[in-house]
Interface confidence: low
Protein backbone atom coordinates (compact mmCIF):
# COMPACT_ATOMS: atom_id res chain seq x y z
CA UNK A 1 0.00 0.00 0.00
CA UNK A 2 1.43 3.37 -1.09
CA UNK A 3 1.95 5.75 1.82
CA UNK A 4 -0.32 8.78 1.63
CA UNK A 5 1.37 12.13 0.92
CA UNK A 6 -0.44 15.45 1.38
CA UNK A 7 0.90 17.88 -1.21
CA UNK A 8 0.47 21.62 -0.68
CA UNK A 9 2.77 23.00 -3.39
CA UNK A 10 2.71 26.67 -2.39
CA UNK A 11 4.56 27.62 0.77
CA UNK A 12 3.42 31.21 0.49
CA UNK A 13 0.41 32.70 -1.21
CA UNK A 14 0.19 36.46 -1.62
CA UNK A 15 -3.29 37.83 -2.06
CA UNK A 16 -4.67 41.35 -2.27
CA UNK A 17 -7.75 42.37 -0.29
CA UNK A 18 -10.92 41.55 -2.24
CA UNK A 19 -9.29 38.90 -4.42
CA UNK A 20 -9.95 35.17 -4.33
CA UNK A 21 -7.29 32.78 -3.05
CA UNK A 22 -6.83 29.24 -4.30
CA UNK A 23 -5.29 26.89 -1.74
CA UNK A 24 -4.01 23.80 -3.51
CA UNK A 25 -3.94 20.35 -1.94
CA UNK A 26 -3.63 16.96 -3.61
CA UNK A 27 -3.25 13.49 -2.12
CA UNK A 28 -1.22 10.62 -3.54
CA UNK A 29 -3.51 7.83 -2.31
CA UNK A 30 -7.18 7.19 -1.67
CA UNK A 31 -6.33 5.25 1.46
CA UNK A 32 -7.00 5.34 4.32
CA UNK A 33 -10.69 6.06 3.91
CA UNK A 34 -11.73 9.33 5.49
CA UNK A 35 -12.36 13.00 4.80
CA UNK A 36 -9.90 15.85 4.09
CA UNK A 37 -10.56 19.01 6.09
CA UNK A 38 -9.00 22.47 5.89
CA UNK A 39 -7.80 24.35 8.97
CA UNK A 40 -6.12 27.64 9.67
CA UNK A 41 -3.39 27.29 12.27
CA UNK A 42 -2.29 24.29 14.28
CA UNK A 43 -2.95 22.88 17.73
CA UNK A 44 -6.14 22.86 19.76
CA UNK A 45 -7.02 26.42 18.81
CA UNK A 46 -7.00 25.84 15.05
CA UNK A 47 -9.91 27.16 13.03
CA UNK A 48 -11.96 24.93 10.73
CA UNK A 49 -12.05 26.47 7.25
CA UNK A 50 -13.82 23.77 5.27
CA UNK A 51 -15.47 20.44 5.97
CA UNK A 52 -17.22 18.85 3.03
CA UNK A 53 -19.50 16.70 5.18
CA UNK A 54 -20.90 19.30 7.55
CA UNK A 55 -21.00 23.00 8.32
CA UNK A 56 -21.72 26.14 6.34
CA UNK A 57 -18.80 27.79 4.55
CA UNK A 58 -20.31 30.41 2.21
CA UNK A 59 -16.97 31.87 0.99
CA UNK A 60 -15.35 28.53 0.24
CA UNK A 61 -15.76 26.53 -2.95
CA UNK A 62 -13.96 23.37 -4.05
CA UNK A 63 -11.88 23.41 -7.21
CA UNK A 64 -12.87 19.88 -8.21
CA UNK A 65 -15.87 17.65 -7.50
CA UNK A 66 -15.19 16.03 -4.14
CA UNK A 67 -18.06 13.56 -4.64
CA UNK A 68 -16.24 11.89 -7.55
CA UNK A 69 -15.15 8.40 -6.55
CA UNK A 70 -11.43 8.71 -7.30
CA UNK A 71 -10.97 12.40 -6.54
CA UNK A 72 -7.50 13.27 -5.26
CA UNK A 73 -7.72 17.06 -5.53
CA UNK A 74 -8.94 18.78 -2.36
CA UNK A 75 -8.02 22.34 -3.37
CA UNK A 76 -10.33 25.12 -2.24
CA UNK A 77 -10.99 28.70 -3.29
CA UNK A 78 -11.78 31.39 -0.70
CA UNK A 79 -13.51 34.47 -2.10
CA UNK A 80 -13.37 38.13 -1.06
CA UNK A 81 -10.18 37.93 1.00
CA UNK A 82 -10.03 40.26 4.00
CA UNK A 83 -7.13 41.04 6.37
CA UNK A 84 -8.66 38.62 8.88
CA UNK A 85 -7.97 35.72 6.49
CA UNK A 86 -4.20 35.93 6.80
CA UNK A 87 -2.60 32.84 8.34
CA UNK A 88 -1.29 29.37 7.55
CA UNK A 89 -3.76 26.93 6.00
CA UNK A 90 -3.41 23.17 6.31
CA UNK A 91 -5.24 20.41 4.49
CA UNK A 92 -5.56 17.52 6.93
CA UNK A 93 -6.50 13.90 6.18
CA UNK A 94 -8.64 12.11 8.75
CA UNK A 95 -8.97 8.35 9.11
CA UNK A 96 -12.40 6.91 9.70
CA UNK A 97 -12.53 5.67 13.26
CA UNK A 98 -14.94 5.08 16.07
CA UNK A 99 -16.50 7.14 17.47
CA UNK A 100 -14.72 10.02 15.76
CA UNK A 101 -12.47 10.50 12.77
CA UNK A 102 -8.81 10.49 13.82
CA UNK A 103 -6.27 12.86 12.30
CA UNK A 104 -3.98 10.87 10.04
CA UNK A 105 -1.73 13.28 8.18
CA UNK A 106 -1.41 17.02 7.61
CA UNK A 107 -0.07 18.88 4.64
CA UNK A 108 2.96 21.17 5.20
CA UNK A 109 0.74 24.25 5.13
CA UNK A 110 0.36 27.26 2.87
CA UNK A 111 0.83 30.67 4.41
CA UNK A 112 -1.61 33.19 3.06
CA UNK A 113 -0.28 36.69 3.45
CA UNK A 114 -1.91 39.87 2.30
CA UNK A 115 -0.19 41.40 -0.66
CA UNK A 116 0.14 45.15 -0.54
CA UNK A 117 2.72 47.34 -2.20
CA UNK A 118 4.89 49.64 -0.14
CA UNK A 119 4.28 53.35 -0.57
CA UNK A 120 6.89 55.36 -2.46
CA UNK A 121 9.83 55.87 -0.09
CA UNK A 122 10.06 59.38 1.32
CA UNK A 123 13.57 60.51 2.18
CA UNK A 124 14.07 63.40 4.58
CA UNK A 125 17.32 65.04 5.52
CA UNK A 126 18.60 66.79 8.62
CA UNK A 127 16.82 69.81 10.06
CA UNK A 128 19.96 71.96 9.82
CA UNK A 129 22.85 72.14 7.39
CA UNK A 130 26.25 70.75 8.35
CA UNK A 131 29.74 71.42 7.05
CA UNK A 132 32.01 68.94 5.27
CA UNK A 133 33.52 66.15 7.38
CA UNK A 134 30.47 66.16 9.63
CA UNK A 135 27.96 63.29 9.66
CA UNK A 136 24.33 63.90 8.81
CA UNK A 137 21.37 61.54 9.01
CA UNK A 138 18.81 60.83 6.31
CA UNK A 139 15.57 59.02 7.08
CA UNK A 140 13.61 56.89 4.64
CA UNK A 141 10.01 55.87 5.33
CA UNK A 142 7.65 53.56 3.47
CA UNK A 143 4.41 52.03 4.70
CA UNK A 144 1.38 49.94 3.89
CA UNK A 145 3.16 46.84 2.62
CA UNK A 146 2.54 43.17 3.23
CA UNK A 147 4.00 40.60 3.67
CA UNK A 148 6.52 41.81 6.23
CA UNK A 149 9.69 40.74 4.38
CA UNK A 150 11.24 43.76 2.70
CA UNK A 151 14.72 44.85 1.64
CA UNK A 152 15.96 48.42 1.96
CA UNK A 153 19.24 49.74 0.58
CA UNK A 154 20.88 53.15 0.66
CA UNK A 155 23.03 54.68 -2.07
CA UNK A 156 25.07 57.84 -2.39
CA UNK A 157 25.67 58.79 -6.01
CA UNK A 158 24.99 55.17 -6.96
CA UNK A 159 27.39 53.69 -4.40
CA UNK A 160 25.83 51.50 -1.73
CA UNK A 161 26.05 52.76 1.86
CA UNK A 162 26.55 50.48 4.84
CA UNK A 163 26.04 52.79 7.84
CA UNK A 164 22.28 52.60 8.38
CA UNK A 165 19.73 51.12 10.75
CA UNK A 166 16.35 49.80 9.71
CA UNK A 167 13.18 48.95 11.64
CA UNK A 168 10.08 47.18 10.36
CA UNK A 169 6.94 47.61 12.47
CA UNK A 170 5.03 46.05 14.04
CA UNK A 171 6.78 42.94 15.31
CA UNK A 172 3.50 41.09 15.66
CA UNK A 173 1.05 39.97 13.02
CA UNK A 174 -0.47 42.92 11.19
CA UNK A 175 -2.56 43.78 8.16
CA UNK A 176 0.30 45.91 6.87
CA UNK A 177 3.76 46.99 7.89
CA UNK A 178 5.93 50.07 7.77
CA UNK A 179 9.66 50.49 7.42
CA UNK A 180 11.89 53.28 8.67
CA UNK A 181 15.60 53.47 8.02
CA UNK A 182 18.18 56.04 9.05
CA UNK A 183 21.44 56.36 7.13
CA UNK A 184 24.48 58.28 8.31
CA UNK A 185 26.42 60.13 5.63
CA UNK A 186 29.78 61.88 6.07
CA UNK A 187 29.70 65.10 4.05
CA UNK A 188 32.46 65.97 1.58
CA UNK A 189 33.14 69.47 0.16
CA UNK A 190 32.03 68.33 -3.32
CA UNK A 191 28.68 66.92 -2.09
CA UNK A 192 26.62 69.91 -3.23
CA UNK A 193 25.70 67.92 -6.35
CA UNK A 194 25.45 64.57 -4.51
CA UNK A 195 22.28 62.61 -3.96
CA UNK A 196 21.24 59.91 -1.52
CA UNK A 197 18.77 57.27 -2.64
CA UNK A 198 16.70 54.87 -0.57
CA UNK A 199 15.70 51.76 -2.49
CA UNK A 200 12.93 49.45 -1.32
CA UNK A 201 12.49 45.96 -2.78
CA UNK A 202 9.37 43.92 -2.02
CA UNK A 203 7.77 40.80 -3.45
CA UNK A 204 4.83 42.89 -4.75
CA UNK A 205 7.12 45.04 -6.90
CA UNK A 206 8.16 42.22 -9.24
CA UNK A 207 11.84 43.07 -9.12
CA UNK A 208 11.30 46.75 -9.85
CA UNK A 209 12.25 48.50 -6.59
CA UNK A 210 10.83 51.83 -5.46
CA UNK A 211 13.23 54.71 -4.88
CA UNK A 212 13.19 57.91 -2.94
CA UNK A 213 15.92 60.52 -3.18
CA UNK A 214 17.23 63.55 -1.36
CA UNK A 215 19.80 66.09 -2.47
CA UNK A 216 22.75 66.68 -0.22
CA UNK A 217 22.59 70.31 -1.32
CA UNK A 218 19.77 70.65 1.21
CA UNK A 219 21.99 69.32 3.99
CA UNK A 220 25.39 70.81 3.33
CA UNK A 221 27.00 74.17 4.02
CA UNK A 222 30.42 74.71 2.47
CA UNK A 223 32.05 77.71 4.17
CA UNK A 224 33.88 80.11 1.87
CA UNK A 225 37.63 80.54 1.59
CA UNK A 226 38.58 84.23 1.60
CA UNK A 227 41.38 86.09 -0.16
CA UNK A 228 42.06 89.82 -0.23
CA UNK A 229 44.50 91.52 -2.61
CA UNK A 230 45.40 95.15 -3.43
CA UNK A 231 46.56 96.59 -6.72
CA UNK A 232 47.64 100.18 -7.34
CA UNK A 233 45.75 101.83 -10.18
CA UNK A 234 47.39 103.68 -13.06
CA UNK A 235 46.28 106.96 -11.64
CA UNK A 236 48.75 106.28 -8.84
CA UNK A 237 46.64 107.66 -6.07
CA UNK A 238 44.05 104.88 -6.15
CA UNK A 239 44.23 101.34 -4.90
CA UNK A 240 41.85 98.59 -5.99
CA UNK A 241 41.10 96.18 -3.13
CA UNK A 242 39.78 92.85 -4.43
CA UNK A 243 38.03 90.47 -2.09
CA UNK A 244 37.54 86.95 -3.44
CA UNK A 245 35.06 84.65 -1.74
CA UNK A 246 35.56 81.15 -3.07
CA UNK A 247 33.88 77.72 -2.97
CA UNK A 248 30.86 78.41 -0.80
CA UNK A 249 27.37 76.93 -0.65
CA UNK A 250 24.53 77.85 -0.37
CA UNK A 251 24.38 81.20 -2.17
CA UNK A 252 23.19 83.46 0.63
CA UNK A 253 26.20 85.56 1.51
CA UNK A 254 26.57 89.14 2.73
CA UNK A 255 29.77 91.13 2.57
CA UNK A 256 30.47 94.30 4.55
CA UNK A 257 33.46 96.60 4.00
CA UNK A 258 34.75 98.46 7.03
CA UNK A 259 37.27 101.30 6.98
CA UNK A 260 38.98 101.66 10.36
CA UNK A 261 36.00 99.83 11.87
CA UNK A 262 33.36 101.99 10.20
CA UNK A 263 30.99 100.41 7.68
CA UNK A 264 31.55 101.88 4.26
CA UNK A 265 29.65 99.40 2.08
CA UNK A 266 27.39 96.35 2.43
CA UNK A 267 26.72 93.99 -0.44
CA UNK A 268 24.63 90.88 -0.91
CA UNK A 269 26.13 88.33 -3.26
CA UNK A 270 24.29 88.50 -6.56
CA UNK A 271 26.37 87.87 -9.65
CA UNK A 272 27.93 84.57 -8.68
CA UNK A 273 30.15 82.17 -10.59
CA UNK A 274 29.14 78.53 -10.20
CA UNK A 275 31.90 75.96 -9.94
CA UNK A 276 31.78 72.45 -11.38
CA UNK A 277 31.17 70.98 -7.93
CA UNK A 278 28.13 73.22 -7.36
CA UNK A 279 29.84 75.68 -5.02
CA UNK A 280 30.00 79.40 -5.83
CA UNK A 281 32.65 82.11 -6.16
CA UNK A 282 32.13 85.83 -5.81
CA UNK A 283 34.41 88.82 -6.13
CA UNK A 284 33.92 92.25 -4.60
CA UNK A 285 36.01 95.37 -5.36
CA UNK A 286 36.61 98.52 -3.41
CA UNK A 287 38.44 101.48 -4.94
CA UNK A 288 40.29 103.49 -2.32
CA UNK A 289 41.58 106.98 -2.98
CA UNK A 290 44.92 107.11 -1.17
CA UNK A 291 45.58 110.78 -1.83
CA UNK A 292 43.07 111.71 0.85
CA UNK A 293 44.66 109.42 3.43
CA UNK A 294 47.07 110.85 5.99
CA UNK A 295 47.32 107.73 8.18
CA UNK A 296 47.45 103.99 7.62
CA UNK A 297 44.00 102.58 6.90
CA UNK A 298 42.76 99.24 8.20
CA UNK A 299 40.33 97.83 5.66
CA UNK A 300 38.27 94.94 6.90
CA UNK A 301 36.01 92.73 4.89
CA UNK A 302 33.35 90.93 6.89
CA UNK A 303 31.62 87.90 5.35
CA UNK A 304 28.41 86.48 6.74
CA UNK A 305 27.50 83.17 5.09
CA UNK A 306 24.16 81.40 5.48
CA UNK A 307 23.38 82.95 8.87
CA UNK A 308 26.66 81.85 10.43
CA UNK A 309 29.01 84.00 12.49
CA UNK A 310 30.79 86.64 10.41
CA UNK A 311 34.36 85.95 9.27
CA UNK A 312 36.74 88.93 9.02
CA UNK A 313 39.73 89.48 6.79
CA UNK A 314 41.73 92.70 7.25
CA UNK A 315 44.27 94.57 5.20
CA UNK A 316 46.42 97.53 6.29
CA UNK A 317 46.69 100.19 3.60
CA UNK A 318 49.98 101.89 4.38
CA UNK A 319 50.27 105.61 3.63
CA UNK A 320 53.67 106.68 2.28
CA UNK A 321 56.07 108.76 4.44
CA UNK A 322 55.71 111.64 1.92
CA UNK A 323 51.93 111.79 2.51
CA UNK A 324 52.46 111.66 6.27
CA UNK A 325 54.92 114.63 6.03
CA UNK A 326 52.36 116.60 4.08
CA UNK A 327 49.87 115.81 6.75
CA UNK A 328 52.14 117.12 9.54
CA UNK A 329 52.92 120.30 7.55
CA UNK A 330 49.23 120.94 7.19
CA UNK A 331 48.70 120.88 10.91
CA UNK A 332 51.25 123.63 11.69
Amino acid sequence: EEELQMIQPEKLLLVAVGESATLNCTVTSLLPVGPVLWFRGVGPGRELIYNQKEGHFPRVTTVSDLTKRNNMDFSIRISSITPADAGTYYCVKFRKGSPENVEFKSGPGTEMALRAKPSAPVVSGPAARATPEHTVSFTCKSHGFSPRDITLKWFKNGNELSDFQTNVDPAGQSVSYSIRSTARVVLAPWDVRSQVTCEVAHVTLQGDPLRGTANLSEAIRVPPTLEVTQQPMRAGNQVNITYQVRNFYPQNLQLTWLENGNVCRTETASTLTENKDGTYNWTSWLLVNTSDQRDDVVLTCQVKHDGQLAVNKSLVLEVSAHQKDQSSDATH
Epitope: G41, V42, G43, P44, G45, E47, A84, G87, T88, E111, A113, P147, R148, D149, T166, N167, V168, D169, P170, A171, G172, Q173, S174
Partner: antibody, heavy 127, light 107 residues
Framework: QVQLVQSGAEVKKPGASVKVSCKAS????????MYWVRQAPGQGLEWMGW????????GYAQKFQGRVTMTRDTSTSTVYMELSSLRSEDTAVYYC????????????????????WGQGTMVTVSS | DIQMTQSPSSLSASVGDRVTITCRAS??????LAWYQQKPGKAPKLLIY???SLQSGVPSRFSGSGSGTDFTLTISSLQPEDFATYYC?????????FGQGTKLEIK
Protein backbone atom coordinates in the same frame (compact mmCIF):
# COMPACT_ATOMS: atom_id res chain seq x y z
CA GLN B 1 15.79 23.65 29.82
CA VAL B 2 14.68 26.95 28.34
CA GLN B 3 15.45 29.84 30.65
CA LEU B 4 16.11 33.57 30.79
CA VAL B 5 18.47 34.86 33.48
CA GLN B 6 18.51 38.59 34.19
CA SER B 7 21.14 40.80 35.81
CA GLY B 8 20.86 41.87 39.45
CA ALA B 9 18.99 44.71 41.14
CA GLU B 10 20.11 48.30 40.50
CA VAL B 11 19.78 51.55 42.44
CA LYS B 12 20.10 54.69 40.34
CA LYS B 13 19.83 58.43 40.78
CA PRO B 14 17.31 60.48 38.76
CA GLY B 15 18.72 61.43 35.36
CA ALA B 16 21.02 58.40 35.21
CA SER B 17 20.76 55.39 32.88
CA VAL B 18 20.36 51.70 33.63
CA LYS B 19 21.23 48.71 31.44
CA VAL B 20 19.57 45.38 32.24
CA SER B 21 20.76 42.15 30.64
CA CYS B 22 18.84 38.96 29.90
CA LYS B 23 20.77 35.82 28.97
CA ALA B 24 18.87 33.13 27.08
CA SER B 25 19.66 29.42 27.08
CA UNK B 26 18.08 26.12 26.06
CA UNK B 27 16.74 27.23 22.67
CA UNK B 28 17.75 28.86 19.37
CA UNK B 29 18.20 32.46 20.48
CA UNK B 30 17.79 34.04 17.02
CA UNK B 31 14.52 32.25 16.20
CA UNK B 32 12.22 33.93 18.73
CA UNK B 33 11.25 37.52 19.38
CA MET B 34 12.17 38.88 22.79
CA TYR B 35 10.15 41.46 24.72
CA TRP B 36 10.59 43.71 27.74
CA VAL B 37 7.80 44.29 30.25
CA ARG B 38 7.94 46.28 33.46
CA GLN B 39 5.88 46.34 36.63
CA ALA B 40 5.90 49.23 39.09
CA PRO B 41 5.41 48.28 42.78
CA GLY B 42 1.80 47.21 43.35
CA GLN B 43 0.89 47.97 39.72
CA GLY B 44 0.06 46.01 36.58
CA LEU B 45 2.23 44.90 33.67
CA GLU B 46 3.45 47.45 31.10
CA TRP B 47 4.83 46.40 27.70
CA MET B 48 7.96 48.32 26.69
CA GLY B 49 8.99 46.91 23.33
CA TRP B 50 10.46 44.09 21.27
CA UNK B 51 13.71 43.06 19.65
CA UNK B 52 14.29 40.63 16.80
CA UNK B 53 17.45 38.81 17.99
CA UNK B 54 18.22 37.73 14.45
CA UNK B 55 18.32 41.15 12.78
CA UNK B 56 18.56 43.44 15.79
CA UNK B 57 15.45 45.31 14.65
CA UNK B 58 13.48 46.86 17.49
CA GLY B 59 10.13 48.44 18.24
CA TYR B 60 9.31 50.49 21.32
CA ALA B 61 6.10 51.63 22.99
CA GLN B 62 5.56 55.34 22.29
CA LYS B 63 5.86 56.12 26.00
CA PHE B 64 9.51 54.99 26.04
CA GLN B 65 10.54 56.22 22.58
CA GLY B 66 13.78 58.17 22.80
CA ARG B 67 14.61 56.84 26.26
CA VAL B 68 14.84 53.11 25.70
CA THR B 69 17.35 51.14 23.64
CA MET B 70 17.14 47.39 23.15
CA THR B 71 20.17 45.55 21.80
CA ARG B 72 21.38 41.99 21.52
CA ASP B 73 24.63 40.05 21.43
CA THR B 74 24.16 36.85 19.45
CA SER B 75 27.55 35.51 20.53
CA THR B 76 26.36 35.33 24.14
CA SER B 77 22.60 34.92 23.45
CA THR B 78 21.94 38.02 25.52
CA VAL B 79 19.51 40.88 25.06
CA TYR B 80 19.91 44.24 26.78
CA MET B 81 17.49 46.99 27.69
CA GLU B 82 18.89 50.42 28.48
CA LEU B 83 16.63 53.12 29.91
CA SER B 84 18.01 56.64 30.15
CA SER B 85 16.96 59.88 31.90
CA LEU B 86 15.59 57.86 34.79
CA ARG B 87 12.90 59.33 37.03
CA SER B 88 11.34 58.05 40.22
CA GLU B 89 8.34 56.65 38.33
CA ASP B 90 10.72 54.28 36.50
CA THR B 91 11.15 52.36 39.77
CA ALA B 92 9.90 48.91 38.79
CA VAL B 93 10.72 45.28 38.20
CA TYR B 94 11.88 44.86 34.59
CA TYR B 95 11.23 41.51 32.90
CA CYS B 96 12.46 40.06 29.63
CA UNK B 97 10.14 37.53 27.99
CA UNK B 98 10.41 35.15 25.03
CA UNK B 99 7.75 34.73 22.34
CA UNK B 100 6.10 31.30 22.18
CA UNK B 101 5.98 31.21 18.39
CA UNK B 102 9.03 30.06 16.51
CA UNK B 103 10.27 32.29 13.73
CA UNK B 104 10.96 35.95 13.31
CA UNK B 105 9.97 38.28 10.50
CA UNK B 106 7.87 36.57 7.84
CA UNK B 107 8.56 33.18 9.45
CA UNK B 108 6.64 34.21 12.59
CA UNK B 109 3.34 32.40 12.13
CA UNK B 110 0.61 32.07 14.73
CA UNK B 111 -0.38 34.20 17.67
CA UNK B 112 2.18 35.74 19.96
CA UNK B 113 2.39 35.15 23.70
CA UNK B 114 5.20 35.24 26.24
CA UNK B 115 5.93 31.68 27.31
CA UNK B 116 9.21 32.12 29.20
CA TRP B 117 10.00 35.05 31.49
CA GLY B 118 13.17 36.17 33.24
CA GLN B 119 13.16 36.33 37.02
CA GLY B 120 12.93 40.14 36.89
CA THR B 121 15.37 42.92 37.76
CA MET B 122 14.40 45.48 40.37
CA VAL B 123 15.45 49.00 39.39
CA THR B 124 15.09 51.64 42.09
CA VAL B 125 15.38 55.31 41.14
CA SER B 126 15.95 57.51 44.16
CA SER B 127 17.88 60.66 44.96
CA ASP C 1 -3.38 51.78 21.15
CA ILE C 2 -5.72 48.90 21.94
CA GLN C 3 -7.14 49.14 25.48
CA MET C 4 -7.74 45.95 27.45
CA THR C 5 -10.30 46.07 30.24
CA GLN C 6 -10.58 43.25 32.76
CA SER C 7 -13.45 42.58 35.13
CA PRO C 8 -13.74 42.20 37.97
CA SER C 9 -10.60 43.89 39.31
CA SER C 10 -10.75 41.59 42.32
CA LEU C 11 -12.84 38.67 43.44
CA SER C 12 -13.10 36.33 46.41
CA ALA C 13 -13.78 32.64 45.92
CA SER C 14 -13.41 29.34 47.67
CA VAL C 15 -11.52 26.16 46.79
CA GLY C 16 -13.65 24.11 44.38
CA ASP C 17 -15.50 27.15 42.97
CA ARG C 18 -15.88 27.80 39.28
CA VAL C 19 -14.46 31.22 38.48
CA THR C 20 -14.77 33.36 35.37
CA ILE C 21 -12.70 36.45 34.50
CA THR C 22 -13.56 38.54 31.47
CA CYS C 23 -11.43 40.74 29.26
CA ARG C 24 -12.65 43.22 26.67
CA ALA C 25 -10.58 44.78 23.87
CA SER C 26 -11.29 48.28 22.57
CA UNK C 27 -11.23 46.90 19.00
CA UNK C 28 -11.35 43.46 17.40
CA UNK C 29 -8.20 41.43 18.02
CA UNK C 30 -9.37 38.16 16.41
CA UNK C 31 -7.93 35.47 18.70
CA UNK C 32 -4.65 37.24 19.49
CA LEU C 33 -5.12 37.09 23.24
CA ALA C 34 -3.14 35.47 26.06
CA TRP C 35 -3.83 34.95 29.76
CA TYR C 36 -1.15 35.03 32.48
CA GLN C 37 -1.06 34.15 36.16
CA GLN C 38 1.22 36.05 38.53
CA LYS C 39 1.99 35.32 42.14
CA PRO C 40 3.59 37.90 44.49
CA GLY C 41 7.31 38.37 43.87
CA LYS C 42 7.27 36.05 40.83
CA ALA C 43 7.29 36.56 37.06
CA PRO C 44 4.01 36.03 35.18
CA LYS C 45 3.26 32.55 33.84
CA LEU C 46 1.54 31.88 30.49
CA LEU C 47 -1.72 29.94 30.85
CA ILE C 48 -3.60 30.42 27.57
CA TYR C 49 -2.55 31.67 24.13
CA UNK C 50 -4.56 32.26 20.95
CA UNK C 51 -7.59 32.95 23.20
CA UNK C 52 -8.31 29.26 23.86
CA SER C 53 -5.12 27.19 23.49
CA LEU C 54 -3.83 25.75 26.75
CA GLN C 55 -0.10 26.24 27.26
CA SER C 56 1.87 23.04 27.76
CA GLY C 57 2.06 22.00 31.43
CA VAL C 58 -0.93 24.12 32.52
CA PRO C 59 -3.70 22.17 34.31
CA SER C 60 -6.81 21.49 32.23
CA ARG C 61 -9.04 23.25 34.79
CA PHE C 62 -7.95 26.47 33.06
CA SER C 63 -9.72 27.29 29.81
CA GLY C 64 -10.09 30.30 27.57
CA SER C 65 -12.74 31.34 25.10
CA GLY C 66 -13.81 34.26 22.97
CA SER C 67 -12.91 36.02 19.77
CA GLY C 68 -13.03 39.57 18.45
CA THR C 69 -13.42 41.84 21.47
CA ASP C 70 -14.79 39.66 24.31
CA PHE C 71 -12.77 36.96 26.05
CA THR C 72 -13.13 34.76 29.11
CA LEU C 73 -10.75 32.84 31.36
CA THR C 74 -12.45 30.08 33.32
CA ILE C 75 -11.08 28.05 36.21
CA SER C 76 -13.45 25.08 36.52
CA SER C 77 -12.56 24.09 40.07
CA LEU C 78 -10.35 26.41 42.11
CA GLN C 79 -7.32 24.92 43.78
CA PRO C 80 -5.36 26.55 46.64
CA GLU C 81 -2.45 27.33 44.30
CA ASP C 82 -4.73 29.26 41.92
CA PHE C 83 -5.07 32.29 44.21
CA ALA C 84 -3.06 34.92 42.31
CA THR C 85 -3.44 37.89 39.97
CA TYR C 86 -4.52 37.18 36.37
CA TYR C 87 -3.76 39.36 33.35
CA CYS C 88 -5.02 39.29 29.78
CA UNK C 89 -2.81 40.63 26.99
CA UNK C 90 -3.39 41.36 23.31
CA UNK C 91 -0.68 40.74 20.74
CA UNK C 92 -2.74 41.79 17.72
CA UNK C 93 -0.87 45.05 17.24
CA UNK C 94 1.95 46.90 18.91
CA UNK C 95 2.13 48.24 21.51
CA UNK C 96 1.00 44.94 23.02
CA UNK C 97 -1.17 45.87 25.97
CA PHE C 98 -2.22 44.16 29.19
CA GLY C 99 -5.42 44.34 31.16
CA GLN C 100 -5.16 45.99 34.58
CA GLY C 101 -5.29 42.59 36.31
CA THR C 102 -7.79 40.61 38.38
CA LYS C 103 -6.79 39.66 41.91
CA LEU C 104 -8.26 36.33 42.94
CA GLU C 105 -8.42 36.01 46.74
CA ILE C 106 -9.51 33.29 49.16
CA LYS C 107 -12.97 33.88 50.59
Amino acid sequence: QVQLVQSGAEVKKPGASVKVSCKASGYTFTSYYMYWVRQAPGQGLEWMGWINPNSGNTGYAQKFQGRVTMTRDTSTSTVYMELSSLRSEDTAVYYCAKDRRRGVGLAAAGTSAFDIWGQGTMVTVSS
Amino acid sequence: DIQMTQSPSSLSASVGDRVTITCRASQSISNWLAWYQQKPGKAPKLLIYAASSLQSGVPSRFSGSGSGTDFTLTISSLQPEDFATYYCQQSYSTPYTFGQGTKLEIK
